[in-house]
């Protein structure tokens, strides 16, 4: 069955998908779609790459990794319950019957209800896209630099997201990864 990934309402969701290009810059078209992989390509396409670049995307969906090195993992920004469901990552390797298809199930949980902090701050503005990582491998660490004033709830959330993000790195070894060439 599909590998399951979880995120909370309001957070960013991460759906891993990787391939190893046969040679640097020798890219393979990839599509991401909402719904299980269909007969051809992707249904309800949310993002597509070609041999050179991302050539189609919709708001809230982006590739944060280095897709030129085969990291075509999808990030969905600020998820809602409606984002739950199966997503298709299809690596469109040239040749008959060569496509690799991965169905990833995204489960969105309601946001945890926490007491209103005494001092509110725009957390996303404080850490713009900082919680995602471009590197891969267990030896890497993510540094925060100097922390602004944030409350305990935010620190807890930050710790959880860092843990989930580090877990996402480890998924490279066990998730949707193929080698080409």
């Amino acid at each position: 069955s599909e590998v399951e990934y979880r995120a909370e309402v309001g957070q960013n969701a991460y759906l891993p998908c990787f391939y190893t290009p046969a040679a640097p810059g020798n890219l393979v078209p990839v599509c991401w779609g909402k719904g299980a992989c269909p007969v051809f390509e992707c249904g309800n396409v949310v993002l597509r790459t070609d041999e050179r670049d991302v050539n189609y995307w919709t708001s809230r969906y982006w590739l944060n990794g280095d897709f030129r090195k085969g990291d075509v993992s999808l990030t969905i920004e600020n998820v809602t319950l409606a984002d739950s469901g199966i997503y298709c990552c299809r690596i469109q390797i040239p040749g008959i019957m060569n496509d690799e298809k991965f169905n990833l199930k995204l489960v969105i949980k309601p946001a945890k209800v926490t007491p209103a902090p005494t001092r509110q701050r725009d957390f996303t503005a404080a850490f713009p896209r900082m919680l995602t990582t471009r590197g891969h491998g267990p030896a890497e660490t993510q540094t925060l630099g100097s922390l602004p004033d944030i409350n305990l709830t935010q620190i807890s959330t930050l710790a959880n997201e860092l843990r989930d993000s580090r877990l996402a790195n480890d998924l490279r070894d066990s998730g949707a990864t193929i080698r080409i060439g």
Epitope: C37, I96, M97, K101
Partner: antibody, heavy 114, light 107 residues
Framework: EVQLQESGPSLVKPSQTLSLTCSVT????????WNWIRKFPGNKLEYMGY???????YYNPSLKSRISITRDTSKNQYYLQLNSVTTEDTATYYC????????WGQGTTLTVSS | DIQMTQSPSSLSASLGGKVTITCKAS??????IAWYQHKPGKGPRLLIH???TLQPGIPSRFSGSGSGTDYSFSISNLEPEDFATYYC?????????FGSGTKLEIK
């Protein structure tokens, strides 16, 4: 909604070439994948091949030497050509499209006989 | 090619009853199976894809399940319009193959 309509001869002689047309309304053949599938008298269904949005084609290897799928984007039609037909090609021919072959024509029945 | 062995080839059932059709693939098809209903003079109608995902507008009386090489399709609370021929299709690779069909008749 996408609608497909097959047309062509109902009778072809052995060794001749079969030509069928699929007329598409409700969508442009410059997007998606456009397929031919046939159903034999014994009810067996066989996938024949496609032409896609860019004009690329794929053919079932069992037919590769005899089949050609082409299109005319100005008419929003695509075509099946099958060479050197035999009585074994007697079937109902369908055109179909969609993520999982969601849309089909009603089929055109072809008999190969001398 | 992946062979799809569909059974039974025919069955009869009563209105309000339940039937189950099976398709066995010659190798793992990773849940990439669709089910179609076919009536004479019409094109096949897609009912289910990816093993169990119901097409919009298809009643929940229709269901599918399975994994690996073994898949099944069921219709419960049979209605008069359900009597037709049913086919499975594997689309795990481009050598798409259909099952041989199951003709469902009224008992």
């Amino acid at each position: 909604e996408v609608q497909l309509q097959e047309s062509g001869p109902s009778l072809v002689k052995p060794s001749q070439t079969l030509s069928l047309t699929c007329s598409v309304t409700g969508d442009s053949i410059t997007s998606g994948y456009w397929n031919w599938i046939r159903k034999f008298p014994g009810n067996k269904l066989e996938y024949m091949g496609y032409i896609n949005y860019s004009g690329s084609t794929y053919y079932n290897p069992s037919l590769k030497s005899r089949i050609s799928i082409t299109r005319d984007t100005s008419k929003n039609q695509y075509y099946l050509q099958l060479n050197s037909v035999t009585t074994e090609d007697t079937a109902t021919y369908y055109c179909a499209t969609g993520n999982h072959f969601d849309y089909w024509g009603q089929g055109t029945t072809l008999t190969v006989s001398s | 090619d992946i062979q799809m062995t569909q059974s039974p080839s025919s069955l009869s059932a009563s209105l309000g009853g339940k039937v189950t059709i099976t398709c066995k693939a010659s190798q793992d098809i990773n849940k990439y199976i669709a089910w179609y209903q076919h009536k004479p003079g019409k094109g096949p109608r897609l009912l289910i894809h990816y093993t169990s995902t119901l097409q919009p507008g298809i009643p929940s009386r229709f269901s599918g399940s399975g994994s690996g090489t073994d898949y099944s399709f069921s219709i419960s609370n049979l209605e008069p319009e359900d009597f037709a021929t049913y086919y499975c299709l594997q689309y795990d690779n481009l050598l798409f193959t259909f099952g041989s069909g199951t003709k469902l008749e009224i008992k």
